[in-house]
Interface confidence: medium
């Protein structure tokens, strides 16, 4: 009977050992599967994040395109209206001009003498830029950078005058210290009678033949309304 009990005990031990080994294997398998699942979840999460990011970028890009499209459409609509009208009113800026505070600005990238620059602007139904405020000064300065650039101010006929008739004496000024240093000219026949923005934005008077860059300006018609989209 004792021998019988020992056999049964051995059998039970064997069964228990097998069960333990099997259970361990199953647990290991589950653990591996769990790891795989975790990895898969992580991978899915990062894929989802990437898709959300891409979608967000696409959305931003689309918004920009739509904004640009609307702007282009408005500009086109305005240009067409200008072409169809009698040309006396301007409701929007010409192509490649920059709109700011109900004025349009065009910034040259080459150089001309003051008179040639002045003529260029007139042929565009505009005038050399007339600076009437510190705010406008900063706007122009930002666009031209540190390069000598003509403005619509000269004293070729004696006193300093803005090309559009804006009063010089009471208006905004931003001369460099000691400038203008040739107030009434020096009888050279084209002396230092034309004003330009210097590399730091402040003004200097210079020989009008100098081949500087220039800025044209034209005012949007105050009375006209923005035309509706097509």
């Amino acid at each position: 009977q004792n021998a019988q009990l020992q056999r049964e005990l051995r059998g039970l031990r064997e069964t228990l050992s097998n069960f333990t080994a099997s259970t361990e294997a199953q647990v290991k398998g589950l653990s591996t599967q769990g790891g795989n699942v975790g990895r898969k979840m992580k991978s899915l999460e990062s894929q989802l994040e990437k898709q959300q990011k891409d979608l967000s970028e696409d959305h931003s890009s689309l918004l920009l395109h739509v904004k640009q499209f609307v702007s282009d459409l408005r500009s086109l609509s305005c240009q067409m209206a200008a072409l169809q009208g009698n040309g006396s009113e301007r409701a929007c800026c010409p192509v490649n001009w920059v709109e700011h505070e109900r004025s349009c600005y065009w910034f040259s990238r080459s150089g001309k003498a003051w008179a040639d620059a002045d003529n260029y602007c007139r042929l565009e139904d505009a005038h050399l830029v007339v600076v009437t405020s510190w705010e406008e000064q900063k706007f122009v300065q930002h666009h031209i950078g540190p390069v000598n650039t003509w403005m619509g101010l000269h004293d070729q006929n004696g006193p300093w005058k803005w090309v559009d008739g804006t009063d010089y004496e009471t208006g905004f000024k931003n001369w460099r210290p000691e400038q203008p240093d040739d107030w009434y000219g020096h009888g050279l026949g084209g002396g230092e009678d034309c004003a330009h923005f210097t590399d730091d934005g402040r003004w200097n008077d210079d020989v009008c033949q100098r081949p500087y860059r220039w800025v044209c300006e034209t005012e949007l018609d105050k009375a006209s309304q923005e035309p509706p989209l097509l």
């Epitope: 080459s110 150089g111 390069v147 000598n148 002396g191 210079d206 033949q209 081949p211």
Partner: antibody, heavy 120, light 107 residues
Framework: QVQLVESGGGVVQPGRSLRLSCVAS????????MHWVRQAPGKGLEWVAV????????NYADSVKGRFTISRDNSKNTLYLQMNSLRAEDTAVYYC?????????????WGQGTTVTVSS | DIQMTQSPSSLSASVGDRVTITCRAS??????LAWFQQKPGKAPKSLIY???SLQSGVPSKFSGSRSGTDFSLTISSLQPEDFATYYC?????????FGPGTKVDIK
């Protein structure tokens, strides 16, 4: 130190082309206008062309207009002069020179020159 | 185009002499004038810019002045190394133009 070194000169037949180069070092090339000036044997200085710091404006002497092209590669600190339809009167030492400003203030630094001889 | 004339075309002087070269522009150029020195077989060297400003590294014996469209370069005390050809140049407008040069040689 600030240095300009020209190259590309040589003997060429009338009607042919030549390209001169000028390599700059010791200063921020992209901030300065650049000029080409030439000097025929036994003669004075003759301005040839200017290019602004950013390449946006180019001007030429009437004697080379339509035949010569000035250009620059700011990434390589190099100025070029492409010379086409060369004539005997283009024979000269060609100098590149730096403009102290963006391209309208003359010259402050000169290279040593490269000789171009146009002869059949 | 702006024409530049120089006088004299050549001059002979002795070491220690005070020498003045003049240059005239055919129209107003403000202060936009430079002076260069060139020795045989060498590149020009900048001496003066803006009519009267001394280029850095240039000795103070060189000076420039302007009266209207007339400009002058003065060497206060001529030294052996100063015998060369001197050119004026206007950069008031394109095309940039040079004077024909003044040759300074030993008397």
């Amino acid at each position: 130190q600030v240095q300009l070194v020209e190259s590309g000169g040589g003997v060429v037949q009338p009607g042919r082309s030549l390209r001169l180069s000028c390599v700059a070092s010791g200063f921020t090339f992209s901030s300065h206008g650049m000029h080409w000036v030439r000097q025929a044997p036994g003669k004075g200085l003759e301005w040839v062309a200017v290019i602004w710091y950013d390449g946006s404006n180019k001007n030429y002497a009437d004697s080379v207009k339509g035949r010569f092209t000035i250009s620059r590669d700011n990434s390589k600190n190099t100025l070029y002069l492409q010379m086409n339809s060369l004539r005997a009167e283009d024979t000269a030492v060609y100098y590149c020179a730096r403009d102290p400003s963006v391209g309208y203030d003359g010259m402050d630094v000169w290279g040593q020159g490269t000789t171009v001889t146009v002869s059949s | 185009d702006i024409q530049m004339t120089q006088s004299p075309s050549s001059l002979s002087a002795s070491v220690g002499d005070r020498v003045t070269i003049t240059c005239r522009a055919s129209q107003g150029i403000g202060n936009h004038l430079a002076w260069f020195q060139q020795k045989p077989g060498k590149a020009p060297k900048s001496l003066i810019y803006a009519a009267s400003s001394l280029q850095s590294g240039v000795p103070s014996k060189f000076s420039g002045s302007r009266s209207g469209t007339d400009f002058s370069l003065t060497i206060s005390s001529l030294q052996p190394e100063d015998f060369a050809t001197y050119y004026c140049q206007q950069y008031s407008n394109y095309p940039v133009t040079f004077g024909p040069g003044t040759k300074v040689d030993i008397k």
